[in-house]
Interface confidence: low
Amino acid sequence: MMTGTIETTGNISAEKGGSIILQCHLSSTTAQVTQVNWEQQDQLLAICNADLGWHISPSFKDRVAPGPGLGLTLQSLTVNDTGEYFCIYHTYPDGTYTGRIFLEVLESSVAEHGARFQIP
């Protein structure tokens, strides 16, 4: 029986060009976490495997950093990063737990100001 629950940072927002930490925490279970997958709408971002450590997807290696803990840091954010992110905890013997985070990347007011008054 799966007794655990996933706590996440929920709905979060960040400025374009900045960075954000995605965090999930599995509680209320004694199951062993064997692997955590971080995915964004069916794209694999990163994996933290209990045996093999962190692996970052080659397409994201320049903008994704492991940690803190089992979390994930997204850097150099763009508006295209807006959307749902999932932390998928593979555990033994419970099975799989999934948490959801919605990230909204906002245009920076400084960036807007700079672009509007940029001298050619």
Epitope: L44, I47, N49, D51, L52, G53, H55, H90
Partner: nanobody
Framework: EVQLVESGGGLVQPGGSLRLSCAAS????????MGWFRQAPGKGREGVSA???????TYSDSVKGRFTISRDNAKNTLYLQMNSLRPEDTAVYYC???????????????????WGQGTLVTVSS
């Protein structure tokens, strides 16, 4: 830390067979996929075969129908049965481990960051 040790390489005549083994140690949970790669003299490393979640397997076109990958979880060992060997199969064969992800069972080496030291297979008459 996971450690992989290959064995079973050697000299074999064309048309002959060999079975490579890869023993895994130092793991806690065993939740990972495994694959075989090879590197011929003067060439880059290429994927040969992988065994992924649910026991799914994949093979490169050059070995399909001749090589068979298998895994004995009780013995923590990966195998590669190589039949109908050809001179072009001559290479150092490496086994490698990668995280388990059900959406991916390809032979790209980019996810494989834990490697054995390799075992040499020479096919020659």
């Amino acid at each position: 830390e996971v450690q992989l040790v290959e064995s079973g390489g050697g000299l074999v005549q064309p048309g002959g067979s060999l079975r490579l083994s890869c023993a895994a140690s130092g793991y806690k949970y065993g939740v990972y996929s495994m694959g075989w790669f090879r590197q011929a003299p003067g060439k880059g490393r290429e994927g040969v075969s992988a065994i992924c979640s649910g026991g799914r397997t994949t093979y490169s076109d050059s070995v399909k129908g001749r090589f068979t990958i298998s895994r004995d979880n009780a013995k923590n060992t990966l195998y590669l049965q190589m039949n109908s060997l050809r001179p072009e199969d001559t290479a150092v064969y490496y086994c490698a481990a990668r995280p388990l992800w059900t959406g991916d069972c390809d032979l790209s080496s980019s996810w494989y960051k834990t490697w054995g030291q390799g075992t040499l297979v020479t096919v020659s008459s």
